[in-house]
């Protein structure tokens, strides 16, 4: 089909452009090309006869057409009005017409844009700026950059008049900045030049620097003043209230006591009319100043609060060193000290964290010592102890019970009795108790500085006759050679005989049995299988005699070497190898076997039918015990002959 | 082998004191609480006290505060009944008891008994 | 104090008989202790913690009971079983006995 293609379809004005004619049909007789989408003889631009090669210029023709015999169509020195369709009309020899359009667009090429500001001083946070891209071209489309980057999304930042505009709402300092526009078309693209936008700001408040406000008698006293401000700050100090001098710093020599006082810096904008002043208290000392600690928490919370302790007054060129409880500063993650030694910072302070603490400044002759600080930490209360720990009292006693729990600031007591409230004490005191007493006791402790609370609840019992005891084991299942077993005979009673047996016998002789607590505690040491018994133990008071259940020990052991049954080692080709392998363990071991290294199976038992020599070779057992961690292993040479 | 004596059967004035003995063999009374009952003719069992004779503690029952006091001498591994102001209700034979472990067993001993007789 | 009732105060059984004796306390006890006594024999413990036969004691004694309320039980008489028996608490001072049972054999 014969087709039109316009190369390039968007055109330059000024430039040309080549309509190029695709498929077009043989054994023609002429062409003739027009202006628009149809044939019109008043918008012919060309004809072309093939035969005599000859080209006519119709109604429509400029001068700046050229016509080529394979039908293409250059147009030079393109015009705006060049702008739309182009029809070529192709007559075949047989008189058979045939059309087709192409078309093109003319576009300007851009001249270079320029930005035009509405306020070339904007003032922070009070003012608006509006750039607009000059000039306005149809047809054109607008883009902006800041610092050679894409506008940032931002509340303050709009576009309008067709991205044409750019307005930035309450400037800021940080708006200062190279701004560029660029208009672009589909045949050119031009960027302008960057316009800075130069915003008024500050001053802020004024920085005195350095910051150490004490200095000793003789040394030099230089201030310097600064702040950020747009233009540059006019600077003016004042010494206790008395204008000094109109600069940024201030340098007084061989300064004395009667230097000291207020200095106030003023900084003052010109553009924005704003005044801001700091005023530092400078003190001179005649000898170097005894240091001081200061705390910024008096009364820290345990495992909540940090506290940062500094080393006063502060000193140029001075070293600062920290004691705590008369000894060098401990490692500790826990503590922290700024860059100059001045602040020693203790994060999630505990209540060992009480010092005391001292702070030192080093001088030419000596150290001078701060006098000692101790922190007062606020904790607890723990969980309150109560004491004597006995449950089982006899009738017509007298029952004293104190209860103690760790709390800064002590604790407030409170005593219930089956939930009902008793007294606001420390210590709780029945006389001349009887069975009625008996009942659940509970010891409150309260810290009124954290407003935490914690509650012990202790079972008595008030009778002559003591129960049927019961023992309490701190190790279930100890494992051999390793652990430690703790036997404890349940309840604990006040004029109480406590005694023991094993397998019904009593107590033997041994380094690695132990009473304590008053006989009511037994201990094994460094358990071994053979102290897998019955332990019993028995209560005797004035009125009673009982004894507990045993309670059998569990001793975890092994696996011991393996023995691999039966002991052969040689057999004949034919035979089946049956081995068993077993090691002395608690709980059993688990067992594999390996054959010239490679394993085999995770049974006790090895069966192989039918052996050849192909079957010599090392047979190692090997067992593990999940519970105690240990494993073992034995290996057996097997010789099969022929 | 663990036993109890006591001394012998007394005849005693109404008014008058008495005090029985109660001397322990196979056990040291020290290592145990001796108890003292009472037992009137054809009557039943009443505790009258127990005493610890490692420091001399003492239980009475409230009905024979004033008239039973008990002691012990370690030294003799003998403890005593004293009765004072008597009547003819303190007529009565008068057991001791232990409670102890003989090795593995809870074990009750009591002496053979003493009897008392008050006379006006 | 606390107060132990025993019944029946006196009973006679046959041999082979099964026999309960009761012991009933005015307040809860933790275990009741039985002796037995012959006469012009010191008594004998019989049972303690309510249920524990004391060395020598045949299998066809047995204890039971607790709170107020416990029983002593032969489960066939026979002749040297003849006897009084008598009742013990021990959870409160002062320590109180039954008055008695006395068993005889029919």
């Known amino acids: 089909k014969l087709t039109i293609e316009s190369t390039p379809f968007n055109v330059a004005e000024g430039k040309e452009v080549l309509l190029l004619v695709h498929n077009l049909p043989q054994h023609l007789f002429g062409y003739s090309w027009y202006k628009g989408e149809r044939v019109d003889g008043n918008r012919q631009i060309i004809g072309y006869v093939i035969g005599t090669q000859q080209a006519t210029p119709g109604p429509a023709y400029s001068g700046r057409e050229i016509i080529y015999p394979n039908a293409s169509l250059l147009i030079q020195n393109i015009i705006q009005n060049d702008t739309g369709f182009y029809t070529l009309h192709v007559i075949k020899s047989d008189l058979v017409n045939e059309e087709a359009t192409g078309q093109f667009r003319v576009y300007p090429e851009l001249p270079k844009p320029s930005i035009s500001s509405n306020n070339s001083k904007p003032v922070e946070d009070k003012d608006a700026v509006a750039f607009t891209c000059e000039p306005e071209t149809q047809d054109a489309t607008y883009l902006w950059w800041v610092n050679n980057q894409s506008l940032p999304v931002s509340p303050r930042l709009q576009l309008s008049n067709g991205n044409r505009t750019l307005t930035l709402f309450n400037v800021t300092r940080n708006d200062t900045a190279s701004y560029k526009c660029e208009t672009q078309n589909p045949v050119s693209a031009r960027r302008s030049d960057s316009v800075i936008l130069n915003v008024l700001y500050g001053p802020d408040a004024p920085t005195i620097s350095p910051l150490n406000t004490s200095y000793r008698s003789g040394e030099n006293l230089n201030l310097s003043c600064h702040a950020a401000s747009n233009p540059p700050a006019q600077y003016s100090w004042f010494v206790n209230g008395t204008f000094q001098q109109s600069t940024q710093e201030l340098f007084i020599p061989n300064i004395t006591v009667n230097n000291s006082g207020s200095y106030t810096c003023q900084a003052h904008n010109s553009d924005t009319g704003l005044n801001r002043t700091t005023v530092t208290t400078i003190t001179v000392y005649a000898e170097p100043p005894k240091p001081f600690i200061t705390s910024n928490n008096s009364n820290p919370v345990e495992d909540e609060d940090a506290v940062a302790l500094t080393c006063e007054p502060e000193i140029q060129n001075t070293t600062y060193l920290w004691w705590v409880n008369n000894q060098s500063l401990p490692v500790s993650p826990r503590l922290q000290l700024s860059n100059d030694n001045r602040t020693l910072t203790l994060l999630s302070v505990t209540r060992n964290d009480v010092g005391p603490y001292e702070c030192g400044i080093q001088n030419e002759l000596s150290v001078d010592h701060s006098d000692p600080v101790i922190l007062n930490v606020l904790y607890g209360p723990d969980d309150p102890t109560i004491s004597p720990s006995y449950t089982y009292y006899r009738p017509g006693v007298n029952l004293s019970l104190s209860c103690h729990a760790a709390s800064n600031p002590p604790a407030q007591y409170s005593w219930l009795i089956d939930g009902n409230i008793q007294q606001h004490t420390q210590e709780l005191f029945i006389s001349n108790i009887t069975e009625k007493n008996s009942g659940l006791y509970t010891c409150q402790a309260n810290n009124s500085a954290s407003g935490h609370s914690r509650t012990t609840v202790k079972t008595i019992t008030v009778s002559a006759e003591l129960p049927k005891p019961s023992i309490s084991s701190n190790n279930s299942k100890p494992v051999e050679d390793k652990d430690a077993v703790a036997f404890t005979c349940e309840p604990e009673a006040q004029n109480t005989t406590y005694l023991w047996w094993v397998n019904g016998q009593s107590l033997p002789v041994s380094p690695r049995l132990q009473l304590s607590n008053g006989n009511r505690t037994l201990t094994l040491f460094n358990v071994t299988r053979n102290d897998a018994r019955a332990y019993v133990c028995g209560i005797q008071n004035s009125v009673s005699a009982n004894r507990s259940d045993p309670v059998t020990l569990d001793v975890l052991y092994g696996p011991d070497t393996p023995i691999i049954s039966p002991p052969d080692s040689s057999y004949l080709s034919g035979a089946n190898l049956n081995l068993s392998c077993h090691s002395a363990s608690n709980p059993s071991p688990q067992y594999s076997w390996r054959i010239n290294g490679i394993p085999q199976q995770h049974t006790q038992v090895l069966f192989i039918a039918k052996i050849t020599p192909n079957n010599n070779g090392t047979y190692a057992c090997f067992v593990s015990n999940l519970a105690t961690g240990r494993n073992n292993s034995i290996v057996k040479s097997i010789t099969v002959s022929a | 082998e663990v036993q109890l004596q006591q001394s012998g059967a007394e005849l005693v004035r109404s008014g008058a004191s008495v005090k029985l003995s109660c001397t322990a063999s196979?056990?040291?009374?020290?290592?145990?609480?001796m108890h003292w009952v009472k037992q009137r003719p054809e009557q039943g069992l009443e505790w009258i006290a127990w005493i610890d004779p490692e420091n001399g503690d003492t239980e009475y029952a409230p009905k024979f505060r004033g008239k039973a006091t008990l002691t012990a001498d370690s030294s003799s591994n003998t403890a005593y009944l004293h009765l004072s102001s008597l009547t003819s209700e303190d007529t009565a034979v008068y057991y001791c008891?232990?409670?102890?472990?003989?090795?593995?067993?809870?074990?009750?001993?009591w002496g053979q008994g003493t009897s008392v007789a008050v006379s006006s | 104090d606390i107060e132990l009732t025993q019944s029946p105060a006196i009973m006679s059984a046959s041999p082979g008989e099964k026999v309960t004796i009761t012991c009933s306390a005015s307040s809860s006890v933790t275990y009741m202790h039985w002796f037995q006594q012959k006469p012009g024999t010191s008594p004998k413990l019989w049972i303690y913690?309510?249920?524990n036969l004391a060395s020598g004691v045949p299998a066809r004694f047995s204890g039971s009971g607790s709170g107020t309320s416990y029983s002593l039980t032969i489960s066939r008489m026979e002749a040297e079983d003849a006897a009084t028996y008598y009742c013990?608490?021990?959870?409160?001072?002062?320590?109180?006995f039954g008055a008695g049972t006395k068993l005889e054999l029919k």
């Open positions: 913690s309510t249920s």
């Open positions: 013990q608490q021990r959870s409160t001072y002062p320590l109180t």
């Open positions: 008891h232990v409670l102890i472990y003989a090795g593995y067993l809870a074990m009750d001993y």
């Open positions: 196979g056990f040291n009374i020290k290592d145990n609480y």
